[in-house]
């Protein structure tokens, strides 16, 4: 509550951050023109990424492009990218849809289209749908703790949001257990409302906000977090504003002295810890 | 303007940016003592890294060392690096600007030079100038698309910069399309009277600032943001505080059981995304 | 100090920082059951990542698990993990510790235990102690150059922590040279009361904070950020929370048709750059 | 049905070589560990050699240094070459693998077995 006889003193703060959880991935497989089932678990180090400070990735999906090399390929038949002629197509020219640079030629995509070669890293990308249910779905069970210290300097105060009373097998529940510090992926969702098994799907932005109202004066003392969900991403985007989180990254090897590369697209949940609030002081 | 009646509240804000563009990158290549013309693409995968948050990286330049392995050679030979004795080398001895500890002896660096021998990923990496142009140069032409969402929690207030009116195809300009949340890095460049050309060889910071000042009383609601752009990193640097923006990173491979790395210096341009305002409401 | 007439504002802030240093690494290593001696250096692209923003991470420790498969294996005899029949062991079940699912069948782990059998990345990784003291433990030695860029837009007003007359060479003291931007991390941690070599096994965050408080009147113009530094993560954190800094990541590569992964759980310092201030201008 | 189908068997002089091969066929999701083990006649079966999906290798102590298990993951084979052979080798030689079948359905499989034998 406002205190107007207070100074008032913004938080200055720092977040860790620690995931745990695993996910087993059940996958079709081709290899060698054989398309057979593929297991496999992801644990930390496969699903999440060394990330600094506010804000932290779980992976909940992914399309990967393998064994892509710098060659000329005919490019991906999106809407509006087939050829009948050479004269469609134009030298040096860079569709920014596009993963690479046009030779000029049209060239066979398949027994049935054609579009226009490009140099780049082929084949390339296929404009494929993310998988339906997702593929790390199950890291709606995942957990997070969340560490937060945090300093008022003006008022020469400092603390955090783990007490050395705090039981490390909690997990944060609304009513029960609003101080606990590790909460479940989903529970995230579900109290911001949102779907966990969709948002997965194509990815996306969820803010945990830590809001720190203190009274530092010694007659009553108050400095406690209080969490709170929202999602920060536009679930009705339109597509041309690339709806969800995704990023692209890639694994390079050489083999037979060529250079290669398996292209990742991870869709994800990134989580952004909004830290805000005030110390008040007489 | 400043309502004094009204209650101010800072902003709470996400970032979520999305590069896209491709480079095609033509350099000399040396393999087995042969030197040849590469041309390679790259794309996003290759340029830019899984970021988090307010900033996202491109790199418009490298310098490569391959190969490298752990083992005994002599140091590069920078100014006052030379030898001609053992007695100017010190067993142990770690000079900053070197890459290794020196074992004491002075060994042919090449034919007329002699350097300290070092134990250091080897052949060290030679402190040769960015290549002039810029490798990547042609980043001038990609785009960002930044997505901001902002929060004033006392107001229980949410917005976005992009509006569900706004055409997915635009590009930012100052005058004709203030609002448009997609940039060319060149054109950021421009508005803050820099040399994106120029910038791009050793590398550089800039700013995108995203004001927002609302006023979110109901009788003259308004709540938009004004974009604007500064370099942050200094260009008139001496050279002994590191002018510009770089960073080493390695690519680790193993080859007849030894295990080697290939070492990258990335120049580029770091964007930084400074979201600043305040929410005033009655 | 508080002037009550002048309109205060925050600060808009920008980091950049470089990490100088290399650190000689002497551990045992085995290959093909032979136990020896191994030694190398570690540089800048091998301790620390390409982070953006206002963190730097340092890796001072680090466990590795090599040549890990998925497969089937033992899982690590953790308390209480031992079994000694099959009904121990529930297939299909993810025990957040462990680091795979079960088979439901209880195999021999080694000579003398028996642990229940999961899919996982295999041999699961091995929960040992981090290495004391610490493998880089020199790291007290690696400088960090801190460049800040600061803005008050209300006031159009910008400046830096690093002014044309400094001198390259110098190394931050709080009595000598209190206004140096190139810190020596052993002596950061020695202003925060801390002990480096201690910190380094576990690793642990430390802050840096800059706080600027400016007076932009002319006639009375002051604006020099200060420098004070303190530790951020809790040293008496009970076990469960996770104490110190630490994240796993892995290296891909495929040998004999198989995917392998070798996984570092890299213990470090996570330095977290705090900027806060204000300009007060009349 | 699974199937392992083991070769290479046959009589050599002591000080001699031999290279034992066995190949796991049907339909199945993923070999994992895969050893050998030797039964001599009159005496309890015992290990050889295994060898994980990974390739870490495990030896008996009176087979270390002389024999070595490998494997191929693309043809699910696994091979023993035996060096330095002694009269006391001499036994039938059995392929083990243990397969998953399904997701998290392992099962334990045994080769028929291939006769070694070891002259003095």
């Known amino acids: 509550s406002d205190k107007l006889y207070q100074r008032k003193e913004p938080v200055i703060s720092s977040v860790h951050t620690k995931v745990k959880g695993i996910a087993e991935v059940t996958e079709n497989v081709t290899e060698g023109g054989v398309t057979k089932l593929g297991h496999s678990i992801f644990d930390t180090a496969d699903y999440t990424f060394p990330l600094q400070g506010n804000s932290f990735f779980v992976m909940t999906n992914y399309v990967k492009s393998e064994g892509q090399v710098q060659t000329l390929c005919p490019e991906y038949p999106r809407r509006g990218a087939q050829c009948s002629s050479d004269r469609r197509c134009k030298k040096g020219w860079m569709d920014p849809q596009s993963k690479g640079i046009q030779t000029g030629r049209c060239v066979p995509y398949d027994k049935t289209r054609k579009t226009c070669e490009v140099s780049a890293w082929c084949p390339t990308e296929e404009e494929k749908e993310a998988p339906r249910p997702a593929l790390l779905r199950s890291a709606e069970n995942f957990t997070v703790l969340i560490k937060n210290n945090i300093h008022f300097p003006g008022h020469n105060y400092t603390t955090r949001n783990i007490l050395p009373t705090m039981n490390g097998s909690c997990t944060f529940h609304k009513t029960w257990d609003p101080q606990c510090s590790i909460f479940r992926l989903g529970d995230i969702f579900q109290e911001a409302g949102e779907n966990f098994t969709e948002v997965a799907v194509q990815g996306g932005i969820m803010g945990i906000e830590i809001y720190w109202d203190c009274n530092l004066d010694s007659w009553s003392h108050h400095c406690r977090p209080r969490y709170s969900f929202r999602r920060l991403d536009d679930k009705n985007m339109d597509e041309s504003f690339v709806p969800g989180y995704n990023f692209r990254y890639a694994k390079y090897y050489k083999e037979n002295n060529v250079e290669k590369r398996t292209l990742i697209k991870a869709f994800g949940i990134r989580f952004d810890i909004l830290v805000f609030g005030t110390g008040g002081k007489f | 303007s400043d309502k004094l009646y009204q209650r101010k509240e800072p902003v709470i804000s996400s970032v979520h940016t999305k590069v896209k563009g491709i480079a095609e990158v033509t350099e000399n290549v040396t393999e087995g003592g042969v030197t040849k013309l590469g041309h390679s693409i790259f794309d996003t995968a290759d340029y830019t890294f899984p970021l988090q948050g307010n900033s996202f990286f491109v790199m418009t330049n490298y310098v490569k060392s391959e190969g490298q392995v752990q083992t005994l050679c002599p140091e590069y030979p920078r100014r006052g690096a030379q030898c001609s004795s053992d007695r100017r080398c010190k067993k142990g001895w770690m000079d900053p600007q070197s890459k290794g500890i020196q074992t004491g002896r002075c060994v042919p660096y090449d034919k007329t030079r002699k350097t300290c021998e070092v134990s250091a990923w080897c052949p060290t990496e030679e402190e040769k100038e960015a290549p002039r142009p810029a490798l990547l140069r042609s980043a001038e032409n990609f785009t960002v698309l930044i997505k901001n969402n902002i929060h004033f929690p006392g107001h229980n207030y949410t917005t976005r910069n992009i509006l569900p009116t706004m055409n997915g195809s635009c590009t930012f300009h100052k005058t004709w399309d203030p609002q448009c949340s997609i940039f060319r890095l060149g054109d950021i460049f421009q508005e803050a009277g820099e040399n994106f050309t120029e910038v791009a060889v050793q590398g550089g910071i800039m700013g995108i600032e995203i004001y927002w000042d609302c006023n979110l009383d109901s009788w003259s609601h308004h709540c938009r943001p004004r974009y604007s752009f500064r370099r942050l990193d200094d260009k008139n640097m001496d050279e002994s505080f590191v002018p510009g923006y770089n960073f080493r990173y390695a690519k680790y491979y193993k080859e007849n059981n030894v295990e080697k790395r290939t070492l990258i210096k990335a120049f580029g341009i770091r964007f930084d995304i400074l979201v600043f305002g305040t929410g005033g409401k009655f | 100090s508080d002037k009550l007439y002048q309109r205060k504002e925050p600060v808009i802030s920008s980091v950049h920082t470089k990490v100088k240093g290399i650190a000689e690494v002497t551990e045992n290593v085995t290959e093909g059951g032979v136990t020896k001696l191994g030694h190398s250096i570690f540089d800048t692209a091998d301790y620390t990542f390409p982070l953006q923003g206002n963190s730097f991470f340092v890796m001072t420790n680090y466990v590795k698990s090599e040549g890990q498969v998925q497969t089937l294996c033992p899982e690590y005899p953790r308390r209480g993990a031992q079994c000694s029949s099959d009904r121990r062991c529930k297939k299909g079940w993810m025990d957040p510790q462990s680091k795979g699912i079960q088979t439901g069948r209880c195999v021999p782990y080694d000579k003398t235990r028996k642990t229940c059998e999961v899919s996982a990345w295999c041999p699961t990784e091995e929960e040992k102690e981090a290495p004391r003291p610490a493998l880089l433990r020199s790291a007290e030695n690696f400088t960090v150059l801190i460049k800040n860029n600061i803005h008050f837009p209300g006031h159009n007003y910008t400046t830096r922590n690093i002014l044309p007359t400094m001198n390259g060479s110098c190394t931050f003291h709080k009595t000598w040279d209190p206004q140096c931007s190139i810190f020596r991390l052993g002596d950061i941690f020695q202003e925060a009361g801390e002990n480096f070599t201690e910190v380094a096994v576990q690793g642990g965050i430390m802050g840096i904070e800059i706080y600027w408080d400016c007076n932009l009147d002319s006639w009375s113009h002051h604006c020099r950020p200060r420098y004070s530094f303190r530790r951020l993560d809790d040293k008496n954190m009970d076990e469960s929370f996770v104490p110190g800094y630490n994240f796993r990541y892995a290296k891909y590569y495929k040998e004999n048709n198989v995917e392998k992964r070798t996984l570092i759980k890299a213990f470090g310092i996570r330095f977290d750059i705090l900027v806060f201030g204000t300009g007060g201008k009349f | 049905e699974v199937q392992l189908v083991e070769s290479g068997g046959g009589l050599v002089q002591a000080g001699g070589s031999l290279r034992l091969s066995c190949a796991a066929s049907?339909?199945?999701?993923?070999?994992?560990?895969m050893a050998w083990y030797r039964q001599a006649p009159g005496k309890q079966r015992e290990l050889v050699a295994d060898?994980?999906?990974?390739?870490?290798?495990n030896y008996a102590d009176t087979v270390n240094g002389r024999f070595t298990i490998s494997r191929d993951n693309v043809r699910n084979t696994v091979y023993l070459q035996m060096n330095s052979l002694k009269p006391e080798d001499t036994a039938a030689y059995y392929c083990?693998?243990?397969?998953?079948?399904?997701?998290?359905?392992?099962?334990?499989?045994w080769g028929q077995g291939t006769q070694v034998t070891v002259s003095s």
């Open positions: 083990y693998a243990r397969i998953e079948l399904g997701v998290l359905e392992p099962r334990d499989y």
């Open positions: 060898i994980t999906r990974g390739d870490r290798t």
């Open positions: 049907g339909n199945f999701f993923r070999v994992n560990t």
